[in-house]
């Protein structure tokens, strides 16, 4: 039951975080203008992954896509990148993940492939998580190095009669939003690993050998089942130790009482 | 058509409080602004102030301690409250409303006010 | 608080004229955001209230002839009048439309020769 849950609250947590990840890099919030210490102006400037904005104090708001790939800086082709490849893996890991949970039943799988798949989901899924958190601390780095270079020459004077307003960035809402979603993929990615090491069939299954007479034709089948003769009921025969693997027809049969929630 | 009207007291005695009322129609005070300028007889405009959509303001620096403006959205009026009036106050107040890149594209006809004893 | 500069205060021109009007601003009016310049220019006519003529600094509002034209960016701004009308003698006033205050120019009166 405890490996159901932590499966299935993994898988939730991904997708919540996943979720986030894919807000945040459609937000055009990334940067935001600096209100602090700066002239109060009648617009807001804030600055996404794919555009800029700026919101008039009148009312209007105007955007303005990036239509350049070549002028664009490395660093924010780099965070595009990054959070791209971060959705790319989590959404890959969603679609294995659904079919790894131990309460959806797909034909006969087995608990090993549920196990394996689960692993795999989960390793994509902290993939994913470091990738968000990556991309977003690369760009709040940028951010901070921008911020104290414009600092440094806020008003440029042309003669020491004009003075030109420099427009200083912060941390836009986007990056918040990109932290905690890979914040939470990640624990998502590391909740089915450990899921995974719940599910995973036991290596070391004793076989049941059953010991006869001379004469008699001695058949057993390994994994700890009925082990028998060629002739009628065998009585002597016990089962030593059951690791948790079941033949095809007992999957089947006998579903466990962790295959429902 | 978007049109602003502005009513005022015409004649105010030094030292009294100022209010004109600014009613707007065919536009909301929710989405839109309205700023506040005057104009002193034979000279040039002064801008006082601004209400904006989400009811923040901003004032002229050299007014701010004796100015405010209000509005009240369900009957879509804004007013204009001046403090401490002197004679220097004497001017033709208009409401305008800001439209793109903030420039003012539709304004009231103006209230005259004088401030004597 | 910005202050903007008007020249000429006065202007005597002939009908059918070109006239050049330049507008000062102690601090950039261009929001670096998206490159617009942030500064408005109005017509005044005796016993009127203000009346826009241009946005942006270059943007006519809708309805104004075409022979006002707005240039500049910055903190040098100009309007030109193409071929001035009788009907095009006012106060013209340039207002700074992005740093509080939103200051006025002192204006520039155009006058018939």
């Known amino acids: 039951m405890a490996v159901t849950a932590c499966q299935g609250l993994g898988f939730v947590v991904s997708l919540i975080g996943i979720a986030g990840i894919i807000a945040a890099t459609c937000m055009d919030q990334w940067s935001t203008q600096d209100l602090y210490n700066n002239p109060v102006t009648a617009v807001f400037n804030y600055q996404g992954l794919w555009r800029s904005c700026v919101r008039e104090s009148s009312g209007f708001t105007e955007c303005r896509g990036y239509f350049t790939l070549l002028g664009l800086p490395a660093m924010l082709q780099a965070v595009r990148a990054l959070m791209i490849v971060g959705i790319v893996l989590g959404a890959i890991g969603l679609l294995v993940s659904i079919f790894a949970l131990k309460c959806i039943r797909i034909g006969s799988m087995e608990d090993s492939a549920k196990a394996n798949m689960t692993l795999t989901s989960g390793i994509m899924f902290i993939v994913s998580g470091l990738c968000a958190i990556a991309g977003v601390s690369v760009f709040a780095n940028m951010l901070v190095t921008n911020f104290w270079m414009s600092t440094a020459n806020m008003y440029t004077g042309m003669g020491g009669m004009v003075q030109t307003v420099q427009t200083r960035y912060t941390f836009g809402a986007a990056l918040f939003v990109g932290w905690v979603a890979g914040g939470l993929t990640l624990i998502g990615g590391v909740m089915m690993c450990i899921a995974c090491r719940g599910l995973a069939p036991e290596e070391t299954n004793y076989k049941a050998v059953s010991y006869h007479a001379s004469g008699h034709s001695v058949a057993y089948k390994p994994g700890g089942f009925k082990a028998s003769t060629g002739f009628g009921s065998n009585t002597k025969n016990k089962k030593i130790y059951d690791g948790g693997a079941r033949t095809e027809d007992e999957v089947q049969s006998y579903p466990s009482k962790h295959d429902y929630v | 058509q978007v049109q602003l009207k502005e009513s005022g007291p015409g004649l105010v005695a030094p030292s009294q409080s100022l209010s004109i009322t600014c009613t707007v129609s065919?536009?909301?005070?929710?989405?839109?602004?309205v700023s506040w300028v005057r104009q002193p007889p034979g000279k040039g405009l002064e801008w006082l102030g601004v209400?904006?959509?989400?009811?923040?303001?901003n004032y002229h620096s050299a007014l701010i301690s004796r100015l405010s403006i209000s509005k009240d959205t369900s009957k879509s009026q804004v007013f204009l409250k001046l403090n401490s009036l002197q004679t220097d106050d004497t001017a033709t107040y208009y409401c305008?409303?800001?439209?793109?890149?903030?420039?003012?594209?539709?304004w009231g006809q103006g209230t005259s006010v004088t401030v004597s004893s | 608080d910005i202050v903007m500069t008007q020249s000429p205060s006065s202007l005597s021109v002939s009908a059918g004229e070109k006239v050049t009007m330049s507008c000062k601003s102690s601090?950039?009016?261009?929001?670096?955001?998206?490159?617009?310049?942030?500064l408005a220019w109005y017509q005044q006519k005796p016993g009127q209230p203000p009346k826009l003529l241009i946005y942006?600094?270059?943007t006519r509002e809708s309805g104004v002839p075409d022979r006002f034209t707005g240039s500049g960016s910055g903190t040098d701004f100009t309007l030109t009048i193409s071929s001035v009308q009788a009907e095009d003698l006012a106060v013209y006033y340039c207002?700074?439309?992005?740093?509080?205050?939103?200051?006025f120019g002192a204006g520039t009166k155009l006058e018939l020769k």
């Open positions: 305008a409303k800001p439209g793109l890149r903030n420039a003012m594209d539709y």
């Open positions: 065919e536009f909301s005070l929710t989405t839109y602004g």
């Open positions: 207002q700074n439309d992005l740093i509080y205050p939103l200051t």
């Open positions: 209400i904006w959509g989400d009811g923040s303001t």
């Open positions: 601090q950039s009016l261009l929001n670096s955001g998206n490159q617009k310049n942030y």
């Open positions: 942006g600094a270059s």
